[in-house]
């Protein structure tokens, strides 16, 4: 069928495939601190990492990309390693009038595969 | 705001950046001779190209990932040019008892972005 | 809800040529395979080809081939159909349809079609 | 180039079953649509890949293919039915071929 079983065992060895990363940064390297009040330091989590054949393919699509690029390589890019989801997070803003609460949907990665 | 404008002009040149682009395939090529009929090639969209900084962000989290490579290269990875949605396309597929129709959501992309 | 709407009738000299539009509404149009389907007075469907925008391609029956053009502009939602070298026999209702992308085989399953449009080839 | 043959016409009193064929050599091994058209009207798909309805078409129109022989059935057949009816598949390089069509009387 055209959904063969996504491959979740790294074939490069420990850590080196897609997978959630925790990344360290301060709202000075997002250029937000101007406007966020808190948290200073955020933990972001990202995704990182190589996609090898078939390993964690999001769909279809990314199925067949694997299959290509093996075939066409100049032509058709690797699968690369992308959020499946997200987690929302709150952050303290500045405004006109004080502080307020925003959440963000798409801010943090929650899980990764390749698409 | 967290959101700034994702960039839509290619600062590296026309065709370089992120963009949706056809790509011939043979079923053998897919390896779906033994279960697809198909009497031509088929047609596939796929997306392929460069995502420099700010182009096409995907989201709040495609910025930031910009922002971060562009600090930390070795550890964050640059943003990279996946499928934002998908068009449905019909497989005819061999059956025991013949041919049928088959719907696939998820086989061909229908617009890119920087994720 | 999904509606194609067609350019209006024509009256046309033998060996000029027409173009007939298609304007699609409610739907995503590069998502979906458009074709030209003719029907003479009294007869048959007869497929003359047709496009994918998504592919930018376009394929033709054999029959027409040469002289039959079809194209699609996304940013209008819009296909047409420009037939030349006109001659009696082509005096018919045009039709675009629509219909689902079938890989390798590209159009048929036809579930829209437009109200047709009527081209009458005379001296 | 693939050919395929449909009965000119068809009559069939109210609430009987008409049976229209489209004929094509081993039509068994392809996928056939039938689309339903009446006078003044752009044709309506009423049945594809053997058996399946578009939404809105009733369930008293279905289709059966084996053989050289694919089979639009329409049971308890009402005066609104009368039209023509055209069988469509692909040929070998995956054409769209329509067949000539069968007018359907419904007679009273």
């Known amino acids: 069928s055209a959904h063969a079983h996504p491959r979740d065992s790294c074939p490069l060895g420990p850590g080196r495939c897609c997978h959630l990363e925790t990344v360290q940064a301060t709202l000075e390297d997002l250029g937000w601190s101007d406007w966020v009040l808190s948290p200073r330091q955020l933990q972001l989590s990202m995704c990182v990492g190589e996609c090898p054949h078939l390993y964690r393919s999001a769909n279809t699509h990314a199925q067949i990309k694997a299959r290509l690029h093996g075939l066409q390589p100049d032509k058709v890019p690797a699968p690369c390693c992308v959020p499946s989801s997200y987690t929302p997070v709150v952050l303290m803003h500045r405004t006109d009038s004080g502080v307020s609460l925003q959440t963000y949907d798409d801010l943090v990665a929650r899980g990764c595969h390749c698409a | 705001s967290a959101h700034a404008h994702p960039r839509d002009s290619c600062p590296l040149g026309p065709g370089r950046c992120c963009h949706l682009e056809t790509v011939q395939a043979t079923l053998e090529d897919l390896g779906w001779s033994d279960w697809v009929l198909s009497p031509r090639q088929l047609q596939l969209s796929m997306c392929v190209g460069e995502c420099p900084h700010l182009y096409r962000s995907a989201n709040t989290h495609a910025q930031i990932k910009a922002r971060l490579h562009g600090l930390q290269p070795d550890k964050v990875p640059a943003p990279c040019c996946v499928p934002s949605s998908y068009t449905p396309v019909v497989l005819m597929h061999r059956t025991d008892s013949g041919v049928s129709l088959q719907t696939y959501d998820d086989l061909v992309a229908r617009g890119c972005h920087c994720a | 809800q999904v509606q194609l709407v067609q350019s209006g009738a024509e009256v046309k000299k033998p060996g000029s040529s027409v173009k007939v539009s298609c304007k699609a509404s409610g739907g995503t149009f590069r998502s979906y395979a458009v074709s030209w389907v003719r029907q003479a007075p009294g007869q048959g469907l007869e497929w003359m080809g047709g496009?994918?925008?998504?592919?930018?391609?376009?394929n033709y029956a054999q029959k027409f081939q040469g002289r039959v053009t079809i194209t699609a502009d996304e940013s209008t939602s819009t296909a047409y159909m420009e037939l030349s070298s006109l001659r009696s026999e082509d005096t018919a209702v045009y039709y675009c349809?629509?219909?689902?992308?079938?890989?390798?085989?590209?159009?048929?399953?036809?579930?829209?079609w437009g109200q047709g449009t009527l081209v009458t080839v005379s001296s | 180039s693939y050919e395929l043959t449909q009965p000119p016409s068809v009559s069939v009193s109210p609430g009987q079953t008409a049976s229209i064929t489209c004929s094509g050599d081993n039509i068994g091994s392809h996928i056939v649509s039938w689309y339903q058209q009446k006078p003044g009207q752009s044709p309506v798909l009423v049945i594809y890949?053997?058996?399946n309805r578009p939404s809105g078409i009733p369930e008293r129109f279905s289709g059966s293919n084996s053989g050289n022989t694919a089979t639009l059935t329409i049971s308890g057949t009402q005066a609104m039915d009368e039209a023509d009816y055209y069988c469509q598949t692909w040929d070998s390089i995956g054409s769209v071929v329509f067949g000539g069509g069968t007018k359907l009387t419904v007679l009273g």
């Open positions: 349809a629509r219909g689902p992308i079938i890989m390798g085989y590209q159009f048929g399953l036809f579930d829209h």
């Open positions: 890949d053997k058996s």
């Open positions: 496009i994918i925008p998504i592919f930018g391609t376009a």
